[in-house]
């Protein structure tokens, strides 16, 4: 399933426009709206940003917010992987990273977030209406997938407000119930909106919550709040998906990861500075495909999953036994 919701980034009107009471009643609906739209903890976020310096260059950042350890991340474009999308990169915490053109650099940013730089020209260049999807797998608990895209009108040179372009897959089991408080809040929100419909709407402002201020940010409400929508699954059509990528399959047999130090697919790429990587603002979260059950253990802290020989917090001595990686 996919559903779309256009929820602009809003700032309350300036205090001078209304009295304190009016200001509070105007702020409240937007707080409630946020609660209603993001009901149920979001699990995956996606950011898509076009670089101002190179219009053909995109940066996709994805992260997983659950407590479980991630066993695989797949980034695709043209739609979700397995539903018309084409794989751009596969990142495994232990067995390394594999990527396909026009992906230039895929890397782990933290234990639970990744980034991918895309660039190209001509047929292999991504375009503004391309949908990018990130799928985080945590075996055996399940997989969570979220998608986002740049709006076609994005101008990287301008400080445009974040444009929500969410795509939500909610076709799987394990949908979380929305709490009664939130349901009440949503009803109350509708009531407030009806009371205030004669008043002018608050002004749209660029979001100032993210330190990076990406040019475009994709996000979607959580699965819980969308479970009843039953929107048909529609794939965004994009004309710039290169035909050459259709033959790129990450599951090409158990040979390409080989052993970490020797195989080209696992060439160490320097530790990811995950401790200092700013996590995107909550407004940029994208929702989950399916949130499932409790996770079977945390992954120990490390700098570059699959790219570091001694990720164990105990240091190199951990390599003495057979359990030395991740």
């Amino acid at each position: 399933m996919r559903t779309e919701a256009q929820v602009p980034a809003l700032q309350p009107p300036e205090p001078g426009l209304e009295g304190a009471m009016g200001h509070r009643t105007l702020v409240l609906p937007w707080v409630l709206l946020t609660l209603c739209v993001t009901a149920g903890t979001p699990e995956v976020w996606v950011q898509v940003r076009m670089e101002a310096t190179e219009l053909s260059s995109f940066t996709i950042r994805c992260g997983f917010l659950g407590s479980g350890s991630i066993s695989l991340v797949t980034v695709s474009w043209g739609g979700p992987n397995g539903a018309g999308g084409t794989t751009l990169a596969v990142l495994h915490p232990e067995r390394g990273i594999r990527q396909w053109a026009p992906a230039r650099q895929a890397r782990w940013e933290t234990q639970s977030s990744i980034s991918l730089i895309l660039e190209g020209s001509g047929a292999s260049s991504p375009c503004a209406n391309t949908t990018f999807c990130c799928k985080f797998a945590s075996f055996p608990e399940g997989s969570w997938e979220a998608c986002g895209s740049l709006p076609p009108s994005s101008d990287p040179g301008l400080s445009a407000p974040p444009t929500p372009a969410p795509i939500l897959r909610a076709d799987l089991a394990g949908i979380l119930g929305v709490s009664g408080v939130l349901l009440f809040g949503c009803v109350y929100l509708l009531h407030l909106l009806r009371r205030h419909k004669h008043r002018p709407a608050p002004r749209l402002q660029p979001s100032r919550t993210s330190p990076q201020a990406p040019r475009a940010r994709a996000w979607a409400p959580s699965q819980a709040s969308q479970a009843a929508l039953h929107v048909p699954y529609a794939t965004i059509n994009t004309s710039c998906r290169p035909a050459t990528l259709d033959t790129a399959h990450p599951h090409g047999g158990p040979s390409w990861w080989a052993s970490l130090p020797t195989h080209a697919a696992h060439r160490p790429q320097g530790p990811a500075a995950w401790a200092s990587t700013p996590i995107p603002a909550r407004g940029s979260f994208v929702s989950v495909e399916n949130g499932l059950y409790a996770q079977a253990g945390e992954r120990p802290p490390h700098t570059g999953p699959g790219l570091t020989l001694f990720p164990d917090p105990r240091g190199p001595r951990a390599m003495e036994g057979p359990l030395g990686v991740r």
């Epitope: 695989l72 495994h92 399940g142 992954r299």
Partner: antibody
Framework: EVQLQQSGPVLVKPGASVKMSCEPS????????VNWMRQSHGKSLEWIGV????????SYNQKFKGKATLTVDKSSSKINMELNSLTSEDSAVYYC?????????????WGQGTSVTVSS | QIVLTQSPAIMFASPGEKVTMTCSAS?????MHWYQQKSGTSPKRCIS???KLASGVPARFSGSGSGTSYSLTISSMEAEDAATYYC?????????FGSGTKLELK
């Protein structure tokens, strides 16, 4: 060549416990999950649980929590499963199998199975 | 848990005949895997990720489906294909297997 070698058949009395092992070879031990299944005679497969050797953290089918315990023996690179409070219903062939992340977690290699017979 | 129902439970096919068996899930799943098990042996992976042919498996095997309905097809039955076939999902914990379809040579 990838192989998962399981321990031999066992005959135990009701109420007793049994420990069986699965020894992977031919691949990097820490890179793959190892699942355990059971198959009673003439019946389908039941998933018991899975363990990731890198940290020894198991995840169980709720049905087998308290019945099965999955552990990793780091010194011998073996994955063990202990079954307790055995009854005749636990008589079955128990399989270990490797899951491949890059293949949708399909179980691409299986052990030969360990036959457990619970009888007084 | 997600229940996988396979049909038919048992089927007979002549050599060269096209065989299709189905696996129906009680709720939507993202992938389906298929395994072949011959009497007295361990299961062997046939199809993974719904439609990917496992290495060493003949091209006459194919898989398809989405959501709650999946199928395994053998384009031309051969004697060595006689076995029990199981579908398996991992979309939600616990992983579950189908009840199995026993394919016998007619």
């Amino acid at each position: 060549e990838v192989q998962l070698q399981q321990s031999g058949p066992v005959l135990v009395k009701p109420g007793a416990s049994v420990k069986m092992s699965c020894e992977p070879s031919g691949y990097t031990f820490t890179h793959y999950y190892v699942n355990w299944m059971r198959q009673s005679h003439g019946k389908s497969l039941e998933w018991i649980g899975v363990i990731k050797p890198y940290n020894g953290a198991p995840s169980y089918n709720q049905k087998f929590k308290g019945k099965a315990t999955l552990t990793v023996d780091k010194s011998s690179s073996k994955i063990n499963m202990e079954l307790n409070s055995l009854t005749s219903e636990d008589s079955a062939v128990y399989y270990c199998a490797r899951s491949d992340d890059f293949d949708g977690y399909a179980m691409d290699y299986w052990g030969q199975g360990t036959s457990v017979t619970v009888s007084s | 848990q997600i229940v996988l129902t396979q049909s038919p439970a048992i089927m007979f096919a002549s050599p060269g005949e096209k065989v299709t068996m189905t696996c129906s899930a009680s709720s939507s799943v993202s992938y389906m895997h298929w395994y072949q098990q011959k009497s007295g042996t361990s299961p062997k992976r046939c199809i993974s990720d719904t439609s990917k042919l496992a290495s060493g498996v003949p091209a006459r095997f194919s898989g398809s489906g989405s959501g709650t309905s999946y199928s395994l097809t053998i384009s031309s039955m051969e004697a060595e294909d006689a076995a029990t076939y199981y579908c398996q999902q991992w979309t939600s914990n616990p992983l579950t297997f189908g009840s199995g379809t026993k394919l016998e040579l007619k």
